[in-house]
């Protein structure tokens, strides 16, 4: 029979490559049986996970699972790092695996060539 423990479905060593400036939703899939647990997000700083206060979060309910979502609107370069969600269930703290966001800063990653550079490289126009 299926366990009635709360389970957090974040894959171990999961990663997301995202762009600074874009919106992004980081999902924590939560399986529970009766009462929805209290869920929070934290960001890893070394070995400690710092709770994310004052961040926009929301719930999305689906048939067999619920998603606790951390919103990035927009993604900032310093959002780079590892995140974990945790659920309080019957006085127990259940922690997910951590998931890592790799943020590409579009400005530094894909600086457009200047007009001078374009002029010196006419083959780029074709």
């Amino acid at each position: 029979k299926e366990s009635c423990d709360v389970q957090l479905y974040i894959k171990r060593q999961s990663e997301h490559s995202i762009l600074a400036g874009d919106p992004f939703e980081l999902e924590c899939p939560v399986k529970y049986c009766a009462n929805r647990p209290h869920v929070t997000w934290c960001k890893l700083n070394g070995t400690t996970c710092v709770k994310l206060e004052d961040r926009q979060t929301s719930w999305k309910e689906e048939k067999n699972i619920s998603f606790f979502i951390l919103h990035f609107e927009p993604v900032l370069p310093n959002d780079n790092g590892s995140y974990r969600c945790s659920a309080n269930f019957q006085s127990n703290l259940i922690e997910s695996h951590s998931t890592t966001l790799y943020v590409t800063d579009v400005k530094s990653a894909s600086e457009r060539p200047s007009k001078d550079e374009m002029a010196s490289r006419p083959w780029l126009l074709y």
């Epitope: 389970q7 479905y9 894959k11 171990r12 999961s14 990663e15 997301h16 070995t47 922690e95 695996h97």
Partner: antibody, heavy 119, light 112 residues
């Protein structure tokens, strides 16, 4: 019934490319990581890399980086291994394996695809 | 890369024997969640590998209880308590704690 069914044996010439498929069924591919493993004739197992079908994120072993491309199409529950610029030394059995990503509760292997590279 | 060293490389034993295969990693396999991601696989000639044990000591469903795994940190053991004819095969340890994931070189278990 859980199955990982790989595409059939291939014979290729040096310099050619090849894409091997691994069709999964009996579980949700998005809940897993798909690994690819090489076994040269009479030798041990070598990890090539893995793909997260849920978001496309891929990790490669440095030994294979640039030589192979791993991908998946979650809509048809199929993973792929592409081998480019084939050499005789790429002759081997290639296996896909699907490991549950959350709690490692299952680890299934495909039957293998034998690739022979010969001029 | 983490080196996985299995010993012995080959082993002759008889049906009913107790057999132990060891696997040593060049660094700890303890992940930050406190678990060691160490698998044992069995491969028979001409067949695909099959996972027997994961997370050091958890048996896959359908795997006979004569197989057991133990260990921590860098030293791990696969034990077969009473060898059966179908157990003669090659056994591999595989770590999936640290990238790139790595296998041991294999231990070939043969009939004496």
């Amino acid at each position: 019934e859980v199955q990982l069914v790989q595409s059939g044996a291939e014979v290729k010439k040096p310099g050619e490319s090849l894409k091997i498929s691994c069709k999964t069924s009996g579980f949700n591919i998005k809940d897993t990581y798909i690994h690819w493993v090489r076994q040269m004739p009479g030798k041990g197992l070598e990890w090539i890399g893995r793909n997260d079908p849920a978001n496309g994120n891929t990790k490669y072993s440095p030994s294979f980086q640039g030589q192979v491309t791993i991908s998946a199409d979650k809509s048809i529950s199929t993973a792929y291994l592409q081998l480019s610029s084939l050499k005789a030394s790429d002759t081997a059995m290639y296996y896909c394996a699907s490991y549950e990503g959350y709690y490692e509760r299952f680890g299934y292997w495909g039957q293998g695809t034998l690739v022979t590279v010969s001029s | 890369d983490i080196q996985m060293t299995q010993s012995p490389s080959s082993l002759s034993a008889s049906v009913g024997d107790r057999v132990t295969i060891t696997c040593r990693s060049s660094q700890s396999l303890l992940d930050r969640d406190g678990k060691s991601y160490l698998n044992w696989l069995q491969q028979k000639p001409g067949k695909a590998p099959k996972r027997l044990i994961y997370l050091v000591s958890k048996l896959d469903s359908g795997v006979p209880s004569r197989f057991s795994g133990s260990g921590s940190g860098t030293d791990f053991t696969l034990t077969i308590s009473s060898l059966q004819p179908e157990d003669f095969a090659t056994y591999y340890c595989w770590q999936d704690t640290h990238f790139p994931y790595t296998f041991g070189q294999g231990t070939k278990l043969e009939i004496k």
